[in-house]
């Protein structure tokens, strides 16, 4: 009788498997920044090191009574979820606990920073195998806490954080909002978002994925063999920390970018009922529940991509939104989305040596999002080709002219503010393979990449009748790298990728005044990586 | 994820009337003061002074010492609780909020963040 949460995240073929690194030893170490813990609990004894680190504020209230088992409750439970003998995700993993939360579960940003610095110092003094840091805590947005997470992540440490239990946008909290952290929301046994009293799991673009976080069985500090159930995004983050530890145990050289991409790729998709989230957050929140991925040896050199949303640009006339990929990832395409439809498009530009995806708001618009498609493409060489806007009534074409470069994405940016110009049907010639065809008065940007065995193709789907959205999916074995609304459509809200599905959204009011011949077309660029093959464009 | 969230950023580049010293007057603060948007979670009186990324070890200590010296001239006692070397250059300080304007004008300071609570989730 295995607890529901372990059944959910560990596929049947993994249940009895012991994850070991190639040399036979499991050298992954998990650092837990939480309350004190009961190291003598049978679930974790012998695999937990209680460091002498202690940086906590005093408990509130004059009548506060410190009871050891209560002080240890949160941390002991999480330690058990990560590496407990019976109810743990990564049963053999070594754990180090740092006390940054007091007996009431309160800590400070400064105490957490000192804890992170302690880990960095330990790493410098005695370099070891892969390190995973579990941050089952949240405070208000903190630039310095996010920066510290960034610095630690760049030393090769994998940080996993709770999204927060405030039923709010995770981007308003730290460390959940740090891009270098794997941020985890909580779901229940029915794969639905966790409700906690009047609140519940956080959501939004800063959440990477969800994991079990309701009624989770784990070590109880009440006695050395006791169990209890606890709920929260801490428990969800502990599951992912355990999964990451198991992944690193098998393959110690996996990087943060690879771990995140694989977690996303192999998660269970589309089981969460998105109606639980506020309407404006539904499109931004990933519909992903974590599961333990197979090893890279079992799955070959798949092309892995994820969608990264920017912050909302805000409503000012020249407001821009910027979406960034992780340093190791390639930005293969850039699109934009606006709820009002008033946007001036999107483009890719280099900032400080890194390609970023930008989107521009239009006059009267409520703001835009930039949507980046970030991929792991080994040995890739990517570049952007752009063409200025053509005269009204004409199309702009851009293609990848370098040898062995394939088109992975298209972006369109309108110089004019007048949206009506873009509502006239464009003169659409037969599309040539591997090229971007611009809307009228649009600058066109083509994202072109060369990588061993990379091949791409365009897949289009058009709908003439009234429809709020048009979708097109890449078939099995192919990965969506680019997603656009093609010229000829009515006023569109934009396009974005949801896993392997390209979604083109149309303005509600546009449905009524669309002429019968005018179709909204979603265009997906689908790519795959076949290491033995040459880079090619597939027609 | 990297844009600032619901966050208070205040420019405290206030020309101090009592700053008679040449080196203090010469340095105009471009650094910002930040604090948690949720008032109940703030910890006024404790501040994380974050220095520019390239700041050297010795400069971190000198900056902290300089803040203590200048505060003492104004009759304030400052307690440096911790110096950060390994993850980012900076220091944690217990001081009156009256000294924020002064601290923001110190060389090498990128921003100052008021300490705040974090909670078990």
């Amino acid at each position: 009788s295995i607890p529901w949460n372990l059944e959910r995240i560990i596929p049947a073929w993994h249940q009895t498997e012991e994850d070991r690194s190639p040399d036979g030893s499991s050298q992954v170490e998990v650092y837990l920044l939480d309350t004190s813990i009961q190291g003598a609990h049978r679930e974790i004894e012998g695999r937990v090191t209680i460091t002498d680190f202690n940086s906590v504020p005093e408990e509130d209230g004059t009548r506060f009574h410190r009871q050891a088992s209560k002080c240890d409750s949160h941390g002991t439970h999480l330690a058990g979820v990560v590496s407990g003998r019976d109810a743990g995700v990564a049963k053999g993993t070594s754990l180090h606990s740092l006390r940054v939360l007091n007996c009431q579960g309160k800590g400070t940003v400064s105490g957490t920073l000192i804890g992170l610095e302690f880990i960095r110092k330990s790493q410098l003094i005695q370099p070891s195998g892969p390190l995973v840091v579990l941050l089952p805590l949240a405070g208000g947005y903190s630039r310095i806490l996010n920066a510290a997470c960034r610095h630690l992540a760049r030393t090769g440490v994998v940080l996993v954080a709770a999204a927060g239990n405030f039923r709010d946008d995770a981007c308003l909290y730290s460390p959940a909002s740090a891009p270098e952290v794997i941020t985890v929301g909580a779901t229940n046994a029915q794969d639905q978002p966790v409700t906690l009293g009047t609140l519940g799991t956080n959501f939004g673009r800063c959440v990477d994925l969800f994991a079990p976080g309701k009624d989770i069985i784990g070590a109880s500090s009440d006695c050395s063999t006791c169990f209890m159930s606890q709920s929260g995004t801490s428990q969800a983050a502990a599951h992912v920390a355990g999964i990451v530890a198991r992944m690193l145990s098998r393959e110690p050289t996996l990087t943060l970018a690879e771990l995140r991409q694989r977690l996303i790729h192999f998660s269970t998709k589309d089981v969460i009922n998105m109606a639980w989230f506020p309407e404006d957050q539904q499109v931004l929140t990933p519909n992903l529940v974590a599961t333990l991925p197979p090893s890279t040896h079992e799955t070959g050199g798949q092309l892995l991509c994820r969608t990264v949303w920017s912050a909302h640009s805000g409503p000012t006339r020249t407001a821009t939104a910027t979406a960034r990929c992780a340093p190791e990832e390639e930005l293969l395409s850039c699109s934009s989305f606006s709820r009002s439809g008033r946007r001036r498009g999107d483009w890719i530009e280099a900032i400080g040596g890194q390609q970023v995806c930008k989107a521009l708001n239009a006059f009267g618009g409520e703001g835009v999002y930039a949507v980046a498609r970030c991929c792991l493409v080994p040995r890739a060489n990517c570049s952007i080709h752009n063409t200025p806007a053509a005269r009204a009534g004409l199309e702009t074409h851009v293609h990848c002219h370098q040898k062995d470069h394939v088109l992975t994405g298209c972006s369109f940016h309108w110089e004019v503010e007048d949206l009506s110009v873009r509502r006239q049907p464009a003169l659409r010639s037969r599309r040539q393979p591997g090229q971007c065809v611009g809307h009228q008065a649009a600058s066109v940007y083509a994202s072109c990449c060369h990588a061993p065995g990379l091949e791409c193709k365009i897949k289009e789907h058009g709908i003439s009748g009234p429809s709020e959205q048009v979708t097109v999916a890449c078939e099995a074995g192919w990965t969506l790298t680019g997603c656009n609304v093609l010229p000829g459509a009515s006023l569109t809200l934009g396009a974005y990728s949801v896993d392997n599905l390209c979604v083109a959204r149309v303005h509600d009011t546009a449905r009524a005044d669309r002429t019968s011949g005018e179709a909204t077309v979603a265009a997906a660029i689908c790519c795959r990586s076949r290491p033995s093959a040459k880079a090619s464009w597939v027609q | 994820q990297d844009e600032d969230g619901d966050y208070e950023e205040l420019m405290l580049a206030l020309p101090s009337q009592e700053d008679g010293l040449a080196d203090e007057a010469a340095h105009v603060a471009t650094a910002t003061f930040r604090r948690c948007s949720k008032e109940a979670w703030r910890l006024p009186g404790t501040y994380i002074v974050v220095l520019m990324e390239e700041t050297q070890r010795l400069q971190i200590e000198q900056t902290a010492h300089r803040l203590q010296t200048r505060a003492a001239r104004r009759g304030y006692v400052i307690k440096v609780l911790h110096i950060f070397y390994d993850l980012f250059p900076g220091f944690l300080v217990k001081m009156s909020s009256d000294l924020l304007g002064l601290a923001l004008k110190l060389p090498h300071v990128e921003y100052i963040e008021e300490d705040s609570f974090v909670f078990a989730q």
Epitope: R42, R85, A87, C223, F227 | -
Partner: antibody, heavy 118, light 108 residues
Framework: EVQLLESGGGLVQPGGSLRLSCKAS????????INWVRQAPGKGLEWIGR????????RYNEKFKGKATISRDNSKNTLYLQMNSLRAEDTAVYYC???????????WGQGTLVTVSS | EIVLTQSPATLSLSPGERATITCRAS??????LNWYQQKPGQAPRLLIY???NRATGIPARFSGSGSGTDFTLTISSLEPEDFAVYYC??????????FGGGTKVEIK
């Protein structure tokens, strides 16, 4: 050889009290917790409480709080169970048992019978 | 509070037969469950600890299995001295120690 030897049982009047002893030998006394368990005639096992001889810390079954008191004398390697306000339903064989590191009761005393009757 | 339910209450078997006793916990207890044997007029004796580990001096015919909430004690071939009462036990928070109601294995 590890041994636990109980004594102090016998006939007690209802409302009376008694003190049972458990003499330990053959191991480091302060290292292991000692539990008191009772068994009414023809019934199952019922846990009363435990003591950690190292620090004197005690833990009781809620049912016995106020009725049972467990103590120890480290100089004599002896544990005690004081029972007050005894009633007929307290008639049972009382055992002391050592809890090992794995939290199982690896050694038991032979038991001592307490009969509460007028 | 965890409740341990043992079944059957009585098991009537002949020597040489296989005995199977189950213990079901009302909550998850991992593998931290112990089994004891008690003969008439004697103190209980530890047989199995942590669900499946035989205590010192316990014959190989005794084995334990299970984890989570469902546990089994198996005596592969009953010897005359095995006819006794068997108890399962776990630790909990309140009360800290819980015993099952017992299973009597008697000669058929």
């Amino acid at each position: 050889e590890v041994q636990l030897l109980e004594s102090g049982g016998g006939l007690v009047q209802p409302g009376g009290s008694l003190r049972l002893s458990c003499k330990a030998s053959g191991y480091t006394f302060s290292r292991y917790g000692i539990n008191w368990v009772r068994q009414a005639p023809g019934k199952g096992l019922e846990w009363i409480g435990r003591i950690d001889p190292g620090n004197g810390g005690t833990r009781y079954n809620e049912k016995f709080k106020g009725k049972a008191t467990i103590s120890r004398d480290n100089s004599k390697n002896t544990l005690y169970l004081q029972m007050n306000s005894l009633r007929a339903e307290d008639t049972a064989v009382y055992y002391c048992a050592r809890a090992n590191d794995g939290y199982s009761f690896d050694y038991w005393g032979q038991g001592t019978l307490v009969t509460v009757s007028s | 509070e965890i409740v341990l339910t043992q079944s059957p209450a009585t098991l009537s078997l002949s020597p040489g037969e296989r005995a199977t006793i189950t213990c079901r916990a009302s909550q998850y207890v991992g593998s931290y469950l112990n089994w004891y044997q008690q003969k008439p007029g004697q103190a209980p004796r530890l047989l199995i600890y942590d669900a499946s580990n035989r205590a010192t001096g316990i014959p190989a015919r005794f084995s334990g299995s299970g984890s989570g909430t469902d546990f089994t004690l198996t005596i592969s071939s009953l010897e005359p001295e095995d006819f006794a009462v068997y108890y399962c036990q776990v630790w909990d928070s309140s009360p800290p120690v819980v015993f099952g109601g017992g299973t009597k294995v008697e000669i058929k």
